[in-house]
């Protein structure tokens, strides 16, 4: 049901004993009410009554979910990863049908040796996690495998992973060029066919804090932005203090509206404050009463 609720001007008392005048809501504003049992509550902006209080949806808070938060929690992953799909041709092992069966002794032994070899090849890459054979096929042994890379999330994670994938390419090219059969014999742990080395595909974790911030801010997406502190992204409105984008309301309080951040100026015993940033003070005139 719709209810018509009278709303008067709200005066907020500041710490200096001053007041902040907030605009009064039109008395005929329709507000949706949710009723649970004999409780009746006004939960705005998609909030719902849980029997005790309004449970608000991001980015709202307050008794009736009428206020907009100054910051929204965004949680980048602890780590980000890349997966490289590679093919190499191993010449020091001859292909047998048993290698197709991942539970066979042949496959297990090949997997152990191949993993050892790749761990040696990529040992200098801090992002390297390991290899995973996806398929073995005829041609001495054509090894389709994934090289897995991982790093801690930082704003520059894509650059770090891109650099790591380049080093992987260099190292696998080097080893498959150097470790080759001589007189039908391999003196290395494994030998390769130089021409059989190919990078098929590279997939990098996609995480964009700006996109997450905008999505969570919903209709306020144009006014929330991402700033970094200690390499951690923060989704903030200009009303959040302590950031480069923070709005300085001087003698006032910052409040979000659908038109962006605005300053609600205070009135003290001695001054009225006005202006976009509440930085223009007008001294109240004093009337002296003589007895």
């Amino acid at each position: 049901p719709l209810a018509t609720i009278p709303v008067s001007t709200t005066s907020l008392t500041s710490s200096e004993g001053s007041t902040i005048s907030t605009p009064s809501v039109d008395i005929s504003t329709p507000v949706t009410t949710s009723i649970v049992g004999d409780q009746c509550s006004r939960c705005k902006n998609g909030g719902f009554w849980d029997g005790l209080k309004c449970q608000c949806l991001t980015p709202y808070y307050g008794e009736s979910c009428e206020e907009v938060v100054n910051s929204i929690d965004i949680a980048p992953p602890e780590t980000v990863s890349a997966q490289m799909e590679l093919t190499v041709t191993v010449t020091s092992v001859k292909f047998t049908d048993e290698l197709k069966n991942h539970s066979s002794q042949e496959f297990r032994e090949f997997n152990k040796t191949f993993t050892e070899q790749m761990n040696i090849v990529y040992s200098g890459i801090p992002e390297y996690v390991g290899v995973n054979i996806t398929n073995l096929r005829l041609g001495s042994v054509v090894v389709e495998h994934d090289v897995l890379l991982r790093t801690k999330y930082t704003p520059e994670y894509k650059t770090a992973l891109d650099n790591a994938t380049e080093v992987v390419k260099q190292k696998i090219t080097k080893v498959t060029t150097e470790q080759i059969m001589t007189n039908d014999n391999c003196s290395a742990l494994m030998c390769f066919n130089t021409t059989g080395t190919q990078v098929q595909n590279i997939t990098v974790t996609q995480y964009d804090p700006v996109e997450e911030c905008r999505q969570k801010a919903e209709e306020y997406e144009d006014y929330f932005l991402v700033e970094y502190r200690d390499q951690k992204p923060y989704c903030i409105s200009p009303c959040e203090s302590g950031f480069n984008a923070s709005k300085n309301c001087n003698h006032g309080k910052c409040q979000m509206s659908q038109n962006g951040a605005r300053c609600l100026c205070v009135t003290t015993e001695t001054h009225w404050y006005s202006g976009e940033d509440c930085n223009q003070g007008t001294q109240k005139s004093h009337h002296h009463h003589h007895h």
Epitope: E98, E116, C186
Partner: nanobody
Framework: EVQLVESGGGLVQPGGSLRLSCAAS????????MSWFRQAPGKEREGVAI???????GYADSVKGRFTISQDNAKNSLYLQMNSLRAEDTAVYYC?????????????????WGQGTMVTVSS
């Protein structure tokens, strides 16, 4: 589990011959590869000879023309016939096995090993 037991080692004079045997438990000869390695005192283990289930054999340059690797699948045994022995052939000889059809004389490529048999070439 594969178990390998070598025998046939001993003392032999330079220019003499010796035949090493390796008895294997488990069905390792019908598929995969078998090989002989050796390790001289203070030196790294090195490949001597290799034989695969597809009939391929390979030898280290230092033993080519002098040593012959063979196997008897019925007896699950591997052999190394060593002729024209030299002092530098003195070492502990190891039998190794793999389920893979290998072309590698690098010890790291091999997964199953015997305890070894000592061959001393001395006058």
């Amino acid at each position: 589990e594969v178990q390998l037991v070598e025998s046939g080692g001993g003392l032999v004079q330079p220019g003499g011959s010796l035949r090493l045997s390796c008895a294997a438990s488990g069905n390792t000869f019908s598929r995969g590869s078998m090989s002989w390695f050796r390790q001289a005192p203070g030196k790294e283990r090195e490949g001597v000879a290799i034989i695969s289930s597809d009939g391929w054999t390979g030898y280290a340059d230092s033993v080519k023309g002098r040593f012959t690797i063979s196997q008897d699948n019925a007896k699950n045994s591997l052999y190394l016939q060593m002729n024209s022995l030299r002092a530098e052939d003195t070492a502990v000889y190891y039998c190794a096995a793999s389920f893979l059809v290998l072309r590698a004389l690098n010890p790291k490529a091999w997964h199953y090993w015997g305890q070894g048999t000592m061959v001393t070439v001395s006058s």
